[in-house]
Interface confidence: low
């Protein structure tokens, strides 16, 4: 016979059988690496029912409770549940030094509180090697060409890549996710698309990489038609 | 008061409140594109309880029930639940033509059967452009170098990339996941790592790409120290 029989009052409606779920997100890599930015750990609770909408957050850094988190107003979702977010600002050095951040969530729709913990990936940091690659000759028949930045050998996978030219940001780029390499490090590619004419005019394009294992957390490699000829 | 009260007999234990979950996986791109391979759609049921272990699968192709699926013996998981898998072999051309595959799962631990449907991504297929990129001069100071294959402009994202040299597979490569580009197509990079000596000796390395929008579903681009000089 089905487990569900005729449901009894102490059971939730089938569509919310699982109750709320909790997800804990790390800070953006760039935020942890630049002193001008504010790194944040974000705790997201989804599938909060309208009957029990109150969510309580408790935050701990290396097991010690902290009280500086900000909880945002709950947002109603299309499926008539709520999503609630709490954000903890962290110290750059604490994150880079591997401190553990715990978000504890309490809600009447849960049999007991849910705890999620996050920290920087453990292991010896490894410095990225950065190489720029010009467009293939075959691509030069097109109106736009691809400039490539290969970033390899880094650990952990937290990294930020950007492009610029003449001191101005270049925004028409896409970066692959980090890929685990056979030696346990990571690599990625970033691809900047530019008009062929800009490349042929000899403009210099630079790939900027931010990673904790780099000196000053930063390096930049340039690429142009004339460089390396 | 908590929804859970003292649980009643018609409710599952809290950790299995959701009952079984169903996941439907597409065939591997290479399997759909090569006549030598066997494309399969895979229906996976997890969190099947030991009290109600029997799972029934029904499969439908474009709404018509088919009976050639193979259900594997259930596997016990660490958390004392079962995982049950059913595999449907599909016709290459049916998948590429966009037929819909539905897996319907029945189990006493479910209030009603669960249906999951999968098909090839809809939309006009777009042919990949394939470009090979030699190692950066800066990388030539290392013992090993990176050969790069940029595959761009393709849709859908189902694709297979391999490397070979002298007719033999080269296995020391990694390929990024497809990345959604600004025009709605996808791109990726594949990186083959080879000993610098092999590159400097003038060996020819080839990047082979399989995608439905390619003539013959296949193309190959080569790369060597002498090519393009």
């Amino acid at each position: 016979e089905s487990k569900y029989g005729p449901p009894c009052p102490s059971c939730p409606a089938p569509e919310f059988l699982g109750g709320p779920s909790v997800f804990l997100f790390p800070p953006k890599p760039k935020d942890t690496l630049m002193i001008s930015r504010t790194p944040e750990v974000t705790c997201v609770v989804v599938d909060v029912s309208q009957e029990d909408p109150e969510v309580q957050f408790n935050w701990y850094v290396d097991g010690v409770e902290v009280h500086n988190a900000k909880t945002k107003p709950r947002e109603e979702q299309f499926n008539s549940t709520y999503r609630v977010v709490s954000v903890l600002t962290v110290l750059h050095q604490d994150w880079l030094n591997g401190k553990e951040y715990k978000c504890k969530v309490s809600n009447k729709g849960l049999p007991s509180s849910i705890e999620k913990t996050i920290s920087k990936a453990k292991g010896q940091p490894r410095e990225p090697q950065v190489y720029t690659l010009p467009p293939s000759q075959e691509e030069m028949t097109k109106n736009q060409v691809s400039l490539t930045c290969l970033v390899k050998g880094f650990y952990p996978s937290d990294i930020a890549v950007e492009w610029e030219s003449n001191g101005q940001p270049e925004n028409n780029y896409k970066t692959t996710p980090p890929v685990l390499d056979s030696d346990g490090s990571f690599f990625l590619y970033s691809r900047l698309t530019v008009d062929k004419s800009r490349w042929q005019e000899g403009n210099v394009f630079s790939c900027s990489v931010m990673h904790e294992a780099l000196h000053n957390h930063y390096t930049q490699k340039s690429l142009s038609l004339s460089l390396g000829k | 008061e908590s929804k859970y009260g003292p649980p009643c007999p018609s409710c599952p234990a809290p950790e299995f409140l959701g009952g079984p979950s169903v996941f439907l996986f597409p065939p591997k791109p290479k399997d759909t594109l090569m006549i030598s391979r066997t494309p399969e759609v895979t229906c996976v049921v997890v969190d099947v309880s030991q009290e109600d272990p029997e799972v029934q699968f029904n499969w439908y192709v474009d709404g018509v029930e088919v009976h050639n699926a193979k259900t594997k013996p259930r596997e016990e998981q660490f958390n004392s639940t079962y995982r049950v898998v059913s595999v449907l072999t599909v016709l290459h051309q049916d998948w590429l033509n966009g037929k819909e595959y539905k897996c319907k799962v029945s189990n006493k631990g479910l209030p009603s059967s669960i249906e999951k449907t999968i098909s090839k991504a809809k939309g006009q297929p777009r042919e990949p452009q394939v470009y090979t990129l030699p190692p950066s001069q800066e990388e030539m100071t290392k013992n090993q170098v990176s050969l790069t294959c940029l595959v761009k402009g393709f849709y859908p994202s189902d694709i297979a990339v391999e490397w070979e040299s002298n007719g033999q597979p080269e296995n020391n490569y990694k390929t990024t996941p497809p990345v959604l580009d600004s025009d709605g197509s996808f791109f990726l990079y594949s990186r083959l790592t080879v000993d610098k000596s092999r590159w400097q000796e003038g060996n020819v390395f080839s990047c082979s790409v399989m995608h439905e929008a390619l003539h013959n579903h296949y193309t190959q681009k080569s790369l060597s120290l002498s090519l393009g000089k």
Epitope: - | T32, L33, M34, I35, S36, R37, H92, Q93, L96, E162, E164, G167, Q168, P169, S208, M210, L214, H215, N216, H217, Y218, T219
Partner: antibody
């Protein structure tokens, strides 16, 4: 460049067996099906069977079941066909042929080997 | 098995002439038909796949077409190296079957 190199001519006695080879180069051996085709002197072509080196799966024309046995060796990128209980009817040129670059219409008999002549005679 | 009836079995023609060879399928084979060329030394080469698609490296004077169950190979202007044997091949269903062949001879 895709190449299929077949073993040399064979002169064999009736009732015996012969094993011929088809060595593939210029592509990944396990990615493509290899067909075998028979041509008797002055006659047309007849499909015998195929082997899929990826999983060693085979499919035979009904009349050749028990006559031919297909095998492959991934390490040397070579496919083999052994013919047994030979009679004069088995005297022919035997071709191996590779499928094309993918699945679909273009997949069939895209590349051909030069053939192996088998003569069955006392 | 699907029967492929190829005609003519032999054909005499002159250099520069346009010729057509035909295969008729006993059952529906869709576009699943190849045309093969066999030289006197036995070398076989695929010319046309999928009824009308030209293989790479094949001269454009070769073309393939279909009308119902009749499939044609046309050579628009014969050159000296074209006077060899031609076979059609269907692969719509197992076993693949070949036509009996056409011998193209120089008149």
């Amino acid at each position: 460049e895709v190449q299929l190199q077949q073993s040399g001519p064979e002169l064999v006695k009736p009732g015996t067996s012969v094993k011929m080879s088809c060595k593939a180069s210029g592509y990944i051996f396990t990615s493509y099906i290899l067909h075998w085709v028979k041509q008797k002197p002055g006659q047309g072509l007849e499909w015998i069977a195929y082997i899929n080196p990826y999983n060693d799966g085979t499919k035979y024309k009904e009349k050749f079941k028990g006559k031919g046995t297909l095998t492959s060796d991934k390490s040397s990128s070579t496919a083999y066909m052994e013919l047994s209980s030979l009679t004069s009817e088995d005297s022919a040129v035997y071709y191996c042929a590779r499928s094309g670059g993918g699945y679909g219409n273009y997949a069939w008999f895209a590349y051909w080997g030069p053939g192996t002549l088998v003569t069955v005679s006392t | 098995d699907i029967q492929m009836t190829q005609s003519p079995s032999s054909l005499s023609a002159s250099l520069g002439e346009r010729v057509s060879l035909t295969c008729r399928a006993s059952q529906d084979i869709g576009s699943s038909l190849n045309w093969l060329q066999q030289e006197p030394d036995g070398t076989i080469k695929r010319l046309i796949y999928a009824t009308s698609s030209l293989d790479s490296g094949v001269p454009k004077r070769f073309s393939g077409s279909r009308s119902g169950s009749d499939y044609s190979l046309t050579i628009s202007s014969l050159e000296s190296e074209d006077f060899v044997d031609y076979y059609c091949l269907q692969y719509a269903s197992y076993p693949p079957t070949f036509g009996a062949g056409t011998k193209l001879e120089l008149k």
